[in-house]
Interface confidence: medium
């Protein structure tokens, strides 16, 4: 004979566990119904009745399979720095990351907490370390017979055109000048310039409206300009 | 239905203090959302005052930090505005209103409580 | 502090489509700004339209819908209707407050 389907709440065989999407209670000392993601517990489980799910309210959400009695508090609401890049709804938490051109000075377990922007090199340095989503730009001095004139977060140094006859020689954050006779060897004219870092940015649809209610908890650091290294701009 | 209703003493002197109520009948200020003040001055103008979460803590508009608080009584379902030192430039028409989280809309408001601040 | 400009007013007829706009003074609206649309009937009563750049209220008609239009928010009235002469307010998120712009007065030419 095939073994009876057991249904929730149900007392489990001894050593044996209880089956998926179910829990054990202790207080009842049963085998009981979990809440799917977007749920909670809103009354626990008894000997002879199942665990009773509620729907999560406004700006709260449970991602997993659950017995909690409360939904988790979503992330506060990104800071004009950043871009929403997961929208709070009831099975999933915010999530923010920096706009181009920042990086995350302080990073969360999803997304970034605190973004600043990107350090730009000011003339006579260019870039050694690009930025990434979570480093800032690391500025070097131009090497002799390299500049850079441009105040930068992507701009490198570049090597200074070669003349026939000097006009006015290159320094760090000057390009040789050269006679009217044109160089002999010349840099591309534009500056080079190192790929910005790109984040990947699903477009996230919020579903519709439905009854619903809770905020946001966590808290926003205050944003300062992040100081300026030798040879940077906190522009 | 979910209802907001201010009250509020309407005529204040001038350095005194601004208290004023918003009783929210058909949900828990527990529950959820954002629990807001905002004013209309005279000539339509709104500005957003702060709020209160649905576990007690606060957002206020930088421009009124220093003069400004919301709490709230979680028993009576109700929240206050407490907006320290004022001026004739806080005449308005003060409003409660309720925003979440997942939608960012502002869907209920309360009518309105006119606050006259003269000596 | 920012600033948050709308057309101060706007002129349609009924049936006509007609976008207000929302215009940021630190630049480009963006999502993370959560743009926020309330209407304002007479008697001070104010009904909140959209959230969060596109989300419609519970109740609003459909009619109603937000967007980002170039650097703007945006909100369309897709066939005009008498009752929709009101003043609409746009209200922008700025990573922890928020502001509302000065307001646009449509009439709707009946």
């Known amino acids: 004979l095939p073994a009876q389907v057991a249904f929730t709440p149900y007392a489990p065989e001894p050593g044996s566990t209880c089956r998926l999407r179910e829990y054990y209670d202790q207080t009842a000392q049963m085998c009981c119904s979990k809440c799917s993601p977007g749920q909670h517990a809103k009354v626990f489980c008894t000997k002879t009745s199942d665990t009773v799910c509620d729907s999560c309210e406004d700006s709260t959400y449970t991602q997993l399979w659950n017995w909690v009695p409360e939904c988790l508090s979503c992330g506060s609401r990104c800071s004009s720095d950043q871009v929403e890049t997961q929208a709070c709804t009831r099975e999933q938490n915010r999530i923010c990351t920096c706009r181009p051109g920042w990086y995350c000075a302080l990073s969360k377990q999803e997304g970034c907490r605190l973004c600043a922007p990107l350090r730009k090199c000011r003339p006579g340095f260019g870039v050694a370390r690009p930025g990434t989503e979570t480093s800032d730009v690391v500025c070097k001095p131009c090497a002799p017979g390299t500049f850079s004139n441009t105040t930068s977060s992507t701009d490198i140094c570049r090597p200074h055109q070669i003349c026939n006859v000097v006009a006015i020689p290159g320094n760090a954050s000057m390009d040789a000048v050269c006679t009217s006779t044109s160089p002999t060897r010349s840099m591309a004219p534009g500056a080079v310039h190192l790929p910005q870092p790109v984040s990947t940015r699903s477009q996230h649809t919020q579903p519709t409206p439905e009854p619903s209610t809770a905020p946001s908890t966590s808290f926003l650091l205050p944003m300062g300009p992040s100081p300026p290294a030798e040879g940077s701009t906190g522009d | 239905d979910v209802q907001l209703q201010e009250s509020g003493p309407g005529l204040v002197k001038p350095s005194q203090s601004l208290s004023l109520t918003c009783s929210v009948t058909?949900?828990?200020?527990?529950?959820?959302?954002?629990w807001n003040w905002i004013r209309q001055f005279p000539g339509n103008k709104l500005e957003w005052m702060g709020y209160i979460t649905n576990d007690g803590s606060n957002n206020y508009n930088p421009s009124l930090k220093n003069r400004i608080s919301i709490t709230r009584d979680t028993s009576e379902n109700q929240f206050f505005l407490k907006l320290n030192s004022v001026t004739t430039e806080d005449t308005a028409t003060y409003y409660c209103?309720?925003?979440?989280?997942?939608?960012?809309?502002?869907?209920?408001w309360g009518q309105g409580t006119t606050l006259t601040v003269s000596s | 502090q920012a600033v948050v400009t709308q057309e101060s007013a706007l002129t349609t007829s009924p049936g006509e489509t007609v976008t207000l706009t929302c215009r940021s003074s630190t630049g480009a609206v963006t999502t993370s700004n959560y743009a926020n649309w309330v209407q304002e009937k007479p008697d001070h009563l104010f009904t909140g339209l959209i959230g969060g750049t596109n989300n419609r209220a519970p109740g609003v008609p459909a009619r109603f819908s937000g967007s980002v239009i170039g650097d703007k928010a945006a909100l369309t009235i897709t066939g005009a209707q008498t009752e929709d002469e009101a003043i609409y307010f746009c209200a922008l998120w700025y990573s922890n407050h928020w502001v509302f712009g000065g307001g646009t007065k449509l009439t709707v030419l009946g």
């Open positions: 058909g949900s828990s200020i527990t529950s959820g959302y954002y």
């Open positions: 209103a309720r925003d979440g989280g997942w939608f960012h809309y502002f869907d209920y």
